[in-house]
Amino acid sequence: SLLPVPYTEAASLSTGSTVTIKGRPLACFLNEPYLQVDFHTEMKEESDIVFHFQVCFGRRVVMNSREYGAWKQQVESKNMPFQDGQEFELSISVLPDKYQVMVNGQSSYTFDHRIKPEAVKMVQVWRDISLTKFNVSYLKR
Amino acid sequence: SLLPVPYTEAASLSTGSTVTIKGRPLACFLNEPYLQVDFHTEMKEESDIVFHFQVCFGRRVVMNSREYGAWKQQVESKNMPFQDGQEFELSISVLPDKYQVMVNGQSSYTFDHRIKPEAVKMVQVWRDISLTKFNVSYLKR
């Protein structure tokens, strides 16, 4: 069954954590649907964003952080491993120095830590997707 | 009760028709939710778009048409009558020479016809909103 979108979950992250998302774009790529994943510092949606990951399907991916309410330097990628009309599985792994984003098992994007991942308190998944699975897994100590 | 989003309805338009939409942004304006309304020439979402109306809440509105699969000259407005966190009522009236867009009863945008409104077969309302009302009214002859 489908999860509600926007999907918001209280979460704690650290090196070894992985966030897994399975979903499908709600429109054809010609119409440029979006997917957005935000790692927030508070349970409030207005809070700062440690890692902002936004896909404009078929066009580009932008990554950024929002610090003290202001967007910082945007990182853009034209890499587009998502398939038009197809389900995707996205996993974001917390490495010691960066986030590694895998799409359908393929390493696709990285984003260097600007704020420590331990600052994350909430993950939000939203925009133009249907969501079938969400998980946060923690590496065994 | 809420209507499904994306919301797609078969529609015929002509001078005197009005499309009315009532809804609410799904996120605070800081997070830049979108609203999009597209008047399509076919029941298929890949079809051409006679009138494309996209709000990036808190930032700007863009209007355009998609003809033979290609986007044409974009019209942009910084006018932002929508209120953060508030319900809105949007009405798009078909005038002889243009579309007139009213927001909460206030004339806010216009877009000159590029393709005759009689070419419209479907209206789609989508992106980051909850939708409580959709109506197409026809002026009595």
């Epitope: 069954s1 999860l3 979950e9 399975k22 909430m122 699975k133 969400f134 998980n135 | -």
Partner: nanobody, 121 residues
């Protein structure tokens, strides 16, 4: 108020079977995932099995092929069928659900109180 109540634990001989149940009750808007964890004396709590909203599952390597997790969406209940039990399966088994309670804007994790499973001859 959301509550998770486990049942089905007990004493069983090696090679035997048990079926654990965990029922989530209260005003629940949506369930994201439900899982079983266990904690043996002097050890850390570890994931045993988890079932997601798309009905996909994941298992700890040590229980693969012996344990089966399933879920009744209608009853907000998760089950753990444990076959070919071994003494090293002895632990307190806890249920965890990530769900959104009515009136809340976010999903959060909830734990049950645990049920004891002892595998011994």
């Amino acid at each position: 108020q959301v509550q998770l109540v486990e049942s089905g634990g007990g004493l069983v001989q090696p090679g035997g079977s048990l079926r654990l149940s965990c029922a989530a009750s209260g005003s629940i808007f949506s369930i994201s995932r439900m899982g079983w964890y266990r904690q043996a004396p002097g050890k850390q709590r570890e994931l045993v099995a988890i079932i997601f909203s798309d009905a996909s599952t994941d298992y700890a390597d040590s229980v693969k092929g012996r344990f089966t997790i399933s879920r009744s969406n209608a009853k907000n209940t998760v089950y753990l069928q444990m076959n070919s039990l071994k003494p090293e399966d002895t632990a307190v088994y806890y249920c965890k659900s990530v769900l959104r309670a009515a009136g809340y804007g976010y999903f959060n994790q909830y734990w049950g109180q645990g049920t004891q499973v002892t595998v011994s001859s």
